[in-house]
């Protein structure tokens, strides 16, 4: 065959869907790798083609579509299951081609098992809630194409394995689930089942998602340093190991940046030639504020360096703020008895 | 100093209606959770209900659900509370207090009684 | 809902005197819980909240315990002022719930 525009394994749509259920999956060409969607390709004569390999295998083989009940099928760019079974796991390609054109591209299909409380292998998206909020809604995830609008399907919630009823403040609104005033406790997996009809057959869609409840941006602060603080002083001899400790709490931001650096006389650690490492650990609350640590330690430290500014820097989305470590060298402790013999006037 | 002053408490008919108000003061009220919490003569504390802070989110208990509705007016630093439907079993002393997500109820007003008879 | 559920129902203890109120969850509420004191004709009071942690200006006498469906409130040694009655509150669900109180009083 002639040479083909290959874009190999798409490993980063990796698909999964439920065992038992339709699915409907999009040709990624037309999403991610060509720069015109299916209509025009096929109004300027391009074909798509599927074909899949089994897993554990390796030979590509055309897929079956004259099944019963059309259980797969293809309808414009997207691949049809009505529903699909444990062993339609694979690597599905599509291939867009005329006599002078081609173009394919692989991804992989993974068909998974769920419990009676929906528990699975399949990895699910999460959904942050601002804790104390007065109404935050959650949607009912990838459900659209499924059924045309004049099918008005029935949706279950679920919290966990408990279907969702007479919660105080979790309220099913068909596709929606509103959270009022939110606490930790929301936290968890919530599922919503869709039960639709189609040509005399009902069909179920469960879609789970994770729901995680986080500081409110109403008592978000510029970041806080505790360490270093006015309170300690570093007070070290030469060839004595200098710890200092950088410890800064962030409230939680969506999507903001949380930095924290050392400077000394000004620089940072990597460009003086002190011998500095910077060890770093983040811990988080239930809210998901954070606290980072970085530890900055000198082995041996120098009396040189026991004179320099050693400087915590923080930033996120909410400001900057840095703070001084208070350093200095110890004052020798008095040689006993010298200092004895010159009070009695000893030579 | 935190303030929380209930006030429109009083003796209404069986089936009457009652407007309960809370202002507070001493701190940035447009930034509490705020709730009513009522107790019957000589009966203990129960939730009544709670709004966010923003007022866009109400929670009732399941007892004044659909009779009572809870309000705010954060330019005024004010809570509210409209009983409609009243009955004798909701006879008692009704105290506004700020809620707080991780430490309950921190402060409470010195309530105001409302008494349903004939 | 969950049912908080307070025992003793009245405890008699001397001045001095140590006193152990106990109060227990329906379900688990992590450490989402409060203690309040309430006198005749006042509002509660918070005296503990995350199971442990004292409320601003509680004295140290006051100390409470416990997390998931277990907790304890310890008056280590009661004053005059303390006999009161003593509510616990779960605030980890919607609705949220008190004990039906501990009346603390004099022998």
């Known amino acids: 065959s002639e040479r083909c525009d290959d874009w190999g394994l798409d490993t980063m749509r990796q698909i999964q869907v439920f065992e038992d259920e339709p699915a409907r999956i999009k040709c990624p060409l037309f999403e991610h790798f060509l720069k015109f969607n299916y209509s025009t390709a096929h109004s300027a004569g391009l074909t798509l083609i599927w074909y899949w390999t089994r897993q554990d295998r390796d030979l590509e083989e055309p897929i079956n579509f004259r099944l019963p009940e059309n259980r797969i099928s293809k309808e414009k760019d997207v691949l049809w299951f009505r529903p699909t079974l444990l062993n339609d796991t694979g690597n599905y390609t599509c291939m867009l081609r005329n006599t002078t054109y081609c173009s394919k591209v692989a991804f992989p299909l993974e068909v998974v098992q769920k419990d009676s409380c929906f528990n699975s292998p399949m990895k699910l998206p999460v959904h942050k809630l601002y804790i104390e909020y007065g109404i935050q809604r959650i949607t009912c995830p990838n459900v659209d194409g499924y059924f045309p609008s004049s099918v008005k399907p029935t949706i279950t919630w679920y919290m966990g394995c408990y279907k969702i009823q007479n919660f105080n403040n979790v309220i099913p609104e068909g596709m929606n689930l509103s959270f009022l005033i939110a606490l930790i406790s929301n936290n968890g997996n919530y599922t919503c089942v869709v039960t639709y009809p189609e040509n005399g057959r009902t069909f179920h869609l469960t879609r789970t998602l994770t729901v995680k409840v986080v500081g409110s941006p109403k008592n978000a602060v510029p970041p806080v340093i505790h360490s270093p603080n006015d309170h300690v002083v570093y007070e070290k001899e030469p060839g004595e190991e200098l710890l200092i400790p950088c410890t800064v709490y962030f409230s939680f931001l969506m999507d903001s940046r949380n930095e924290v650096w050392w400077t000394i006389d000004g620089k940072k650690p990597d460009d003086i030639t002190i011998d500095v490492t910077i060890n770093e650990s983040i811990s988080h609350s239930r809210t998901e504020d954070e606290t980072r640590t970085q530890i900055l330690s000198i082995k041996k430290v120098t009396s040189e360096d026991l004179k320099r500014s050693y400087v915590c820097h923080a930033r996120s989305a909410k400001g900057e703020v840095a703070k001084a470590a208070k350093v200095k060298q110890k004052v020798p402790a008095p040689r006993y008895t010298v200092e004895l013999a010159c009070g009695f006037g000893a030579t | 100093e935190v303030q929380l002053l209930e006030s429109g408490g009083g003796l209404v008919q069986p089936g009457g209606s009652l407007r309960l108000s809370c202002a507070a003061s001493g701190f940035t009220f447009s930034a509490y959770t705020m709730s009513w919490v009522r107790q019957a003569p000589g009966k203990g504390l129960e939730w009544v209900s709670a709004?966010?802070?923003?007022?866009?989110?109400?929670l009732y208990a399941d007892s004044v659900k659909g009779r009572f509705t809870i309000s705010r007016d954060n330019s005024k630093n004010t809570l509210y509370l409209q009983m409609n439907s009243l009955r004798a079993e909701d006879t008692a002393v009704y105290y506004c207090a700020r809620s707080l997500y991780w430490s309950g109820f921190d402060y409470w007003g010195q309530g105001t009684l409302v008494t349903v008879s004939s | 809902e969950i049912v908080m559920t307070q025992s003793p129902a009245t405890l008699s203890v001397s001045p001095g005197e140590r006193a152990t109120l106990s109060c227990r969850a329906s379900q688990s509420v992590s450490s989402n819980l409060a203690w309040y004191q309430q006198k005749p004709g006042q509002a509660p009071r918070l005296l503990i909240y995350?199971?442990?942690t004292r409320a601003t200006g509680i004295p140290a006498r006051f100390s409470g315990s416990g997390s998931g469906t277990e907790f304890t409130l310890t008056i280590s040694s009661l004053q005059s002022e303390d006999f009161a009655v003593y509510y616990c509150?779960?605030?980890?669900?919607?609705?949220?719930?008190f004990g039906q109180g501990t009346k603390v009083e004099i022998k």
């Open positions: 709004i966010s802070y923003e007022g866009d989110g109400t």
């Open positions: 995350g199971a442990s």
């Open positions: 509150q779960q605030y980890n669900n919607w609705p949220w719930t």
